[in-house]
């Protein structure tokens, strides 16, 4: 008699999930000459302890602190990039800005990006059924409680110049329900943070408009003005040739505005 | 930090030369326009010239076009303004600021800059 599954709302574990994982520590720990003591095997039990056998509502940052030790990473605390709804940019932006890094350029990030995953209570099995949506089922699902992990501990290690990427394109450019809106802001160190810049990203080809002055620019602005932390606001108004500027600032599509 | 700071200032006769440097320390990218301004005694301060990221594009008032050049070295993290022919009513102190988006499409406004530096003073005497 098969034995009855919870059938959550959202999609189901990643296919291939525990090879996949394993797959890319290893690449990652071959391509980053400081991440080669790392024993992938211990990191893919450390990762699959958090969440197999347990109730997937039910996850703590207490059941992922294995594996964050296993993940511990230094990265320059001044070259911090975060994001918010503009994933995409922000990484192929990190690519060529070589010494900026994203949460999704450290190793447990790596590890995770775009990938879904649950257990099942008093079971070893992972389930590629379903797995609990945020919104529909509850909020502390593996995933989810991973991100927030992850992004509480980047935003706790930033300091001087934080960036954040914002796509201007959203009827919210600032979200406070976003990770970066509910976590990552409210873990940046004022000690150690002195200012937050944000990158507005304009999605419109002839948007000139100052996006910096967005209503929900001046909610974030105020929420970090009252937590002690500069605030500063930047339009970039042609992403396609920021980046390709960046890369090669000699082209000669370069010495036009951008 | 982020830090704009002017320097370079100073005492000189009229037809003499000085160059201003802004350095912007503390920067992981420079890839932002910059532009210096300068405010004369209880006036406003006005746009006198900017450079958009790369360097390859600038912009002058009319009243120092053909006099000063603006330039960057993002290597060096360094603005610098050449001022040339200097006249008496160029005296002021002059401000570099950075620009809120990389090209120099509002770099005549106030409102176009976020970042500023401390002033450094410019007097031509006659």
């Known amino acids: 008699v098969p034995r009855w599954r919870q059938q959550w709302s959202g999609p189901g574990t990643t296919k291939r999930f525990p090879e996949t994982v394993l797959a890319r520590c290893v690449k990652y720990t071959e391509i980053h000459p400081e991440m080669r003591h790392v024993d992938c095997q211990s990191v893919w039990d450390a990762f699959k302890g958090a969440f197999i056998s347990k109730h997937p509502c039910n996850i703590t940052e207490e059941d992922y602190q294995p594996l964050m030790k296993l993940g511990t990473q230094t990265v320059p605390c001044n070259k911090i990039l975060l994001w918010s709804r503009i994933k995409d940019l922000a990484h192929q932006f990190t690519q060529v800005q070589r010494d900026m890094f994203t949460l999704e350029d450290t190793l447990l990030g790596y590890l995770a990006d775009d990938l879904t995953w649950c257990g099942e209570f008093n079971t070893s099995k992972i389930n590629y059924q379903s797995c609990p949506d945020w919104r529909k089922d509850c909020s502390n699902n593996p995933v989810s409680v991973f991100w927030k992990t992850v992004s509480r501990r980047f935003a706790e290690a930033a300091c001087d110049v934080v960036h954040v990427m914002l796509n201007g394109s959203r009827s919210k450019i600032f979200d406070k329900n976003s990770t970066f809106g509910s976590v990552e802001v409210h873990n940046l160190q004022p000690e150690k943070v002195q200012t937050l810049e944000a990158w507005v990203i304009h999605g419109g080809r002839e948007d000139s408009r100052d996006l910096c002055q967005d209503p929900t620019i001046k909610e974030l602005e105020s929420i970090i003005s009252k937590r002690n932390i500069q605030f500063s606001c930047k339009n970039i108004y042609r992403p396609d040739k920021f980046l390709q500027c960046v890369k090669n600032p000699e082209d000669s599509s370069c010495t036009s505005e951008i | 930090d982020v830090q704009l700071q002017a320097s370079g200032g100073g005492l000189v006769q009229a037809g003499g030369s000085l160059r201003l440097s802004c350095e912007f320390s503390?920067?992981?990218?420079?890839?932002?326009?910059m532009g210096w301004f300068r405010q004369f005694p209880g006036k406003e301060r006005e746009f006198v010239a900017a450079?958009?990221?790369?360097?390859?594009?600038?912009d002058y008032s009319d009243s120092v076009k053909g006099r000063f050049t603006i330039s960057r070295d993002n290597v060096k993290s360094t603005m610098y303004l050449v001022m040339n022919s200097l006249k008496p009513e160029d005296t002021a102190v002059y401000y570099c600021?950075?620009?809120?988006?990389?090209?120099?499409?509002?770099?005549?406004?106030?409102?176009?800059?976020?970042?500023w530096g401390r002033g450094t003073r410019v007097t031509v005497s006659s």
């Open positions: 600021a950075e620009a809120r988006s990389a090209e120099l499409g509002s770099s005549r406004k106030i409102q176009g800059y976020d970042q």
């Open positions: 450079i958009n990221w790369s360097g390859s594009s600038v």
């Open positions: 503390g920067r992981t990218f420079s890839g932002f326009a």
